[in-house]
């Protein structure tokens, strides 16, 4: 695309190129042949994050505690507030408009990736040689106990939900 009649950080209005307002400011009046563009800073709890010709600033996002949200980063005149979720909860979308409780991994499954404020717990089935006997959002699959290292023998085989049961070796008579 060839360049347009007005340069970057300018806009075309009534046959002239006016300067855009910088981030954090809104347009009060367009430039004329004799005057510059007039801009005003955004008010408290407002922002504009681009060079713009907006006549109203945007309201900062509200992190509603009733939806499990809290402020991760306070907004400025140039940036929106960033919300995240309370401990034990995660965002339901990229915009983080509400939160849901982290899921727990059922017995037979372990935590592959612990949940964050923006992503849920990722579970994986415990492979052979590993087990999980609890429902947890933190516990990984644990390896079965090694009876041999304790000079014991397996009395009951392990499963993905239970550890092996070790017992003493039969004594030769």
């Amino acid at each position: 695309e060839p360049p347009t009649a007005c340069r970057e950080k300018q806009y075309l209005i009534n046959s002239q190129c006016c300067s855009l307002c910088q981030p954090g400011q809104k347009l009060v009046s367009d430039c004329t042949e004799f005057t510059e563009t007039e801009c005003l800073p955004c008010g408290e709890s407002e922002f504009l994050d681009t060079w713009n010709r907006e006549t109203h600033c945007h309201q900062h996002k509200y992190c509603d505690p009733n939806l499990g949200l809290r402020v991760q980063q306070k907004g400025t005149s140039e940036t929106d507030t960033i919300c995240t979720c309370e401990e034990g909860w995660h965002c339901t979308s990229e915009a983080c408009e509400s939160c849901v409780l982290h899921r727990s991994c059922s017995p037979g499954f372990g935590v592959k990736q612990i949940a964050t404020g923006v992503s849920d717990t990722i579970c994986e089935p415990c492979p052979v040689g590993f087990f999980s006997n609890v429902s947890s959002a933190f516990e990984k699959c644990h390896p079965w106990t090694s009876c041999e290292t304790k000079d014991l023998v397996v009395q009951q085989a392990g499963t993905n939900k239970t550890d092996v049961v070790c017992g003493p070796q039969d004594r030769l008579r």
Partner: antibody
Framework: QVQLVQSGAEVKKPGASVKVSCKAS????????IEWVRQAPGQGLEWIGV????????NYNEKFKGRATLTADKSISTAYMELSRLRSDDTAVYFC?????????WGQGTLVTVSS | DIQMTQSPSSLSASVGDRVTITCRAS??????LNWYQQKPGKAVKLLIS???RLHSGVPSRFSGSGSGTDYTLTISSLQPEDFATYFC?????????FGQGTKVEIK
Amino acid sequence: QVQLVQSGAEVKKPGASVKVSCKASGYGFTNYLIEWVRQAPGQGLEWIGVINPGYGGVNYNEKFKGRATLTADKSISTAYMELSRLRSDDTAVYFCARGGSGFAFWGQGTLVTVSS
Amino acid sequence: DIQMTQSPSSLSASVGDRVTITCRASQDISNHLNWYQQKPGKAVKLLISSTSRLHSGVPSRFSGSGSGTDYTLTISSLQPEDFATYFCQQGNTLPWTFGQGTKVEIK
């Protein structure tokens, strides 16, 4: 005083191109946009496009995109409007105008007649 | 594109009359409305820019008003040299568009 002097009348055949010039004087040529407008016989005004003579940036009316080409030569304070693939309904008076707040100053117009 | 509807398309008036021409835009044009005068064989003249700003050298009998979509050009006391065609034009959104014109004739 500000003056925009356009080239003389042209008669063209359908399918041909025409290039109209607009020589500016009395102000800083690169400080203002140059607008192009046409007026068919007995009709209203129709905007063609605008050029920034300072660096050649342009905006066109979608209707003329691909057929109209706006250029400017800073060294001689002259803007040009070329219209290609002419049709009989392109018969009109073509105007250049200096921007500012609105089309502040106008050329006298150039009659382009398209006829076989 | 923004449509500009000008009325009346023509009017007959006498010297000294007060004349009003209106222009309606198909959407809000934020006061970016200009008025022009065209006489046969003469260069088009800008009369008023941005709704109400009189262009340099234009007599004060010409005035403009309006907002949003509705705008008015008023000639307070028509003079012989004012018999001409008048156009409105919006400069808010590309492509710039014009009204169809109002021809002011001698009664």
